[in-house]
Amino acid sequence: EEELQVIQPDKSVSVAAGESAILHCTVTSLIPVGPIQWFRGAGPARELIYNQKEGHFPRVTTVSESTKRENMDFSISISNITPADAGTYYCVKFRKGSPDTEFKSGAGTELSVRAKPSAPVVSGPAARATPQHTVSFTCESHGFSPRDITLKWFKNGNELSDFQTNVDPVGESVSYSIHSTAKVVLTREDVHSQVICEVAHVTLQGDPLRGTANLSETIRVPPTLEVTQQPVRAENQVNVTCQVRKFYPQRLQLTWLENGNVSRTETASTVTENKDGTYNWMSWLLVNVSAHRDDVKLTCQVEHDGQPAVSKSHDLKVSAHPKEQGSNTAAENTGSNERGSSDYKDDDDKHHHHHH
């Protein structure tokens, strides 16, 4: 009689995570009598996966009925495979005894697990940045196997090239993670822009996973200010408007100053949205010129999104307007309707930055 051989016909088996793995093993003889055991790994630290003789192995089932006469097929199925199950599995024949002793091992079957990467998570900078600045975005995806993976960055569908990617760990592992950092230059038109991280892996069958970040969470577009004097409503009243244009996000507070003294503060509420996602807002001030003997310096001061204030001033010439008798108080009002620019031009075109 020829000596028993343990045949593991598959050198390697690849299984998708969550599926079952079938590991084939046959013996060539009924002799010697004794059980089959399956191990992961070799040597003293090997892990018992299945023991025909005894033990409870809830994930393992025998492919054939091992109690049936002349059975020589000791293939097993392992259910619900995870990346942690990867390794080399050995089918080992034992010889009956007290205790049973190892008789012969198969050559082993390497089980590799194909695990899908997790949905990429894209995160941007902690603080907002303004156009022309470069900001970094990170993309992370975990738990995939095998190690080979492709990551691409896009901004509004255009592929980016300025990024660095690492796959960890460098050595062998049951599963891997990818981390990538991309640099993006912001423009004033980026409120509606998206940054996309795209991950392609063998497990995804050509349908890559995408993670997105909206640049609206990252960008800050500072407003431009224009202060104009509108046509006179009444002989002693002047309407001055402050146009706040192209700002994002909406959080904005406006303060009117008359000769450096706070006249009124208000918060942007009824704004209009531009096509590019930025906002416009207008505030106006009715000034009773009869209450002023000298020229009035009107300043529109805007604090946008917690940043240092930006201001624009307009010099109101009192001499140009006759004073109305019997009135010595300044009448003020506000409005939020956008109006056309006045024929009057600003005397001061400069932005005044007040640092807090």
């Epitope: 009689e1 009924l30 002799i31 009598v33 004794g34 059980p35 023991n51 025909q52 003789k53 005894e54 033990g55 009925e65 091992s66 109690t67 049936k68 006469r69 002349e70 059975n71 009956k96």
Partner: antibody
Framework: QVQLVQSGAEVKKPGASVKVSCKAS????????INWVRQAPGQGLEWIAM????????HYNQIFKDRATLTTDTSTSTAYMELRSLRSDDTAVYYC????????????WGRGTLVTVSS | DIVLTQSPDSLAVSLGERATINCRAS??????????IFWYQQKPGQPPKLLIY???NLDSGVPDRFSGSGSGTDFTLTISSLQAEDVAVYYC????????FGQGTKLEIK
């Protein structure tokens, strides 16, 4: 190690039934056949039947087919052999034995249960 | 059914001498290249103990003075040098079909 522990001796009257138990330990009960064999005093071995605890497949010696019933309780790893319509010539030691190689052989034996049938 | 006939029914052999027990099947017990014959030893008051499986393979823990041979219908159990502890009744069993036992051979010391 493999152990098969059988129930105690029984004395029965002719026409009665007996149910002998065999509790297995030291191995996975559902992975190996259990055989039942009897031996009358001073006589040889006589095979009664066998059962596969994994699916309750049974094979009976034609002589015992109508009177013997094998069952198992996998929750307690116990095999049972019931013999009905007892006669005096059923007096014997009844053994359970485990087939370790699926060769329909008897590798490990219980110590036996003496069943005495007497009026 | 396959009938197994053992010979002799009883045997007396001197210590250290060879003992030979025969088992003949009423038809072949061979299948798939294996001979489905098993030999058991039973001492008084004890259950039988498996000695030889598939005609010629020594079970674990069995002294190598025991051996089995034969094929088809004729099989032999041999004890090469009889020891006092070998006094027992020996049975052959087949499993080519449903199992049956031979009638047994009683081995004594001469």
């Amino acid at each position: 190690q493999v152990q098969l522990v059988q129930s105690g001796a029984e004395v029965k009257k002719p026409g009665a039934s007996v149910k002998v138990s065999c509790k297995a330990s030291g191995y996975t009960f559902t992975n190996y056949w259990i055989n039942w064999v009897r031996q009358a005093p001073g006589q040889g071995l006589e095979w009664i039947a066998m059962i596969d605890p994994s699916d309750s497949e049974t094979h009976y010696n034609q002589i015992f087919k109508d009177r013997a019933t094998l069952t198992t309780d996998t929750s307690t790893s116990t095999a049972y052999m019931e013999l009905r319509s007892l006669r005096s010539d059923d007096t014997a030691v009844y053994y359970c034995a485990m087939d370790y190689g699926s060769l329909y052989a008897m590798d490990y034996w219980g110590r036996g249960t003496l069943v005495t049938v007497s009026s | 059914d396959i009938v197994l006939t053992q010979s002799p029914d009883s045997l007396a052999v001197s210590l250290g001498e060879r003992a030979t027990i025969n088992c003949r099947a009423s038809k072949s017990v061979s299948s798939s290249g294996y001979n489905y014959i098993f030999w058991y030893q039973q001492k008084p008051g004890q259950p039988p103990k498996l000695l030889i499986y598939l005609a010629s393979n020594l079970d674990s823990g069995v002294p190598d003075r025991f051996s089995g041979s034969g094929s088809g219908t004729d099989f032999t159990l041999t004890i090469s040098s009889l020891q006092a502890e070998d006094v027992a009744v020996y049975y052959c069993q087949h499993s080519r079909e449903l199992p049956t036992f031979g009638q047994g051979t009683k081995l004594e010391i001469k």
